[in-house]
């Protein structure tokens, strides 16, 4: 029969022959022959291969370097890489999470729209009319102005995006 030019899924072509790939978590030690199957060997500790493969070396698990603010979110296995995340108050600088930066704070006049996670930074939004923020914070949302009316008071000083309104007593009309 004609030697194959393409192989089935989970196979690879070598020496005009289709050989089985090694399963995830194992590396190749010997290609198959006409008389023998592919020989594989599990990856060692701190190594992995995450696909059906013909690799002769396993990949090293990612190291979550605490000096870069990283910690292990999910320990790697022989089939999966380690997943790193950042320490509390920090977030990854990229999708690969190779280093961390401090969460940004929202300045006065801005509130937190979305609190930062280990992989995303704080999202700030300007405080709309009727709301204010007078602090620099990575957690505080914009607060609504105080409602003077509900306290039977009147606005003595208008609020801004950075300050609350100032309420005062109503002027009594003398008879």
């Amino acid at each position: 029969p004609e030697p194959p030019t393409a192989c089935r899924e989970k196979q690879y072509l070598i020496n005009s022959q289709c050989c089985s790939l090694c399963q995830p978590g194992q590396k190749l030690v010997s290609d198959c022959t006409e008389f023998t199957e592919t020989e594989c060997l599990p990856c060692g500790e701190s190594e992995f291969l995450d696909t059906w493969n013909r690799e002769t070396h396993c990949h090293q698990h990612k190291y979550c370097d605490p000096n870069l603010g990283l910690r292990v979110q999910q320990k790697g296995t022989s089939e999966t890489d380690t997943i790193c995340t950042c320490e509390e108050g920090w977030h990854c600088t990229s999708e690969a999470c190779e280093s961390c930066v401090l969460h940004r704070s929202c300045s006065p006049g801005f509130g937190v729209k979305q609190i930062a996670t280990g992989v995303s930074d704080t999202i700030c939004e300007p405080c709309p009319v009727g709301f204010f923020s007078n602090v620099s914070s990575a957690f505080e949302k914009c607060h609504p102005w105080t409602s003077c009316e509900t306290k039977d008071l009147v606005v003595q000083q208008a609020g801004t995006n950075k300050t609350d309104v100032v309420c005062g007593p109503q002027d009594r009309l003398r008879a």
Epitope: Q23, Q26, V29, T36, E39, C40, T56, T77, E79
Partner: antibody, heavy 121, light 113 residues
Framework: QVQLQESGPGLVKPSETLSLTCTVS????????LHWIRQPPGKGLEWIGV???????DYNPSLKSRVTISKDTSKNQVSLKLSSVTAADTAVYYC???????????????WGQGTLVTVSS | DIVMTQSPDSLAVSLGERATINCKSS????????????LAWYQQKPGQPPKLLIY???TRESGVPDRFSGSGSGTDFTLTISSLQAEDVAVYYC?????????FGQGTKLEIK
Amino acid sequence: QVQLQESGPGLVKPSETLSLTCTVSGFSLTTYGLHWIRQPPGKGLEWIGVIWRGGNTDYNPSLKSRVTISKDTSKNQVSLKLSSVTAADTAVYYCAKNSYYGQGGHAMDYWGQGTLVTVSS
Amino acid sequence: DIVMTQSPDSLAVSLGERATINCKSSQSLLHSFNQKNYLAWYQQKPGQPPKLLIYFTSTRESGVPDRFSGSGSGTDFTLTISSLQAEDVAVYYCQQHYTTPFTFGQGTKLEIK
């Protein structure tokens, strides 16, 4: 039937190179890998390394800088070389056939009788 | 390297009685993708090379009597001889065949009481 026979000098001087040969019959070295294992007198087993049937090798990291395993398929022979030997390398040296059981499973299913190598001046 | 530790170091059992040898590995020998445990057992009689008894924790090599059985998973394994015979006197070694460097336990010497 499957047979393995280790051969080589029984006495090696310190700092010299230990050279052993494993001659096999009843199977082909292109079909099966071959391991070297040693056993100091009265002690346990230590894996030295393997030459897989495809010709690539894996060594014990504790010996890697000193060990070389190679094969001559046409002569059905595998050689072990261990350099810069000391008294701590005195042991019975075994060669053993690798058997592959699928799913990444390997074991040593046939062993030679072993040869005692003494390192002494 | 994976460290293999056997217990006890030596064992004396009466003929016809059950003998149990334990083996512990420093890391799991269970491959999560195929759920196989990569542990083998060898028997070495005085003046002889080791002989393969069991691989993949519990699969007996052909020709090995069924009184020999293996069990365990992860890091804890056991070799059991259900009814000890005189010819079973030997040193028994566990060995991880998970990954290189392949490593052996220190051995358990089995004698007749």
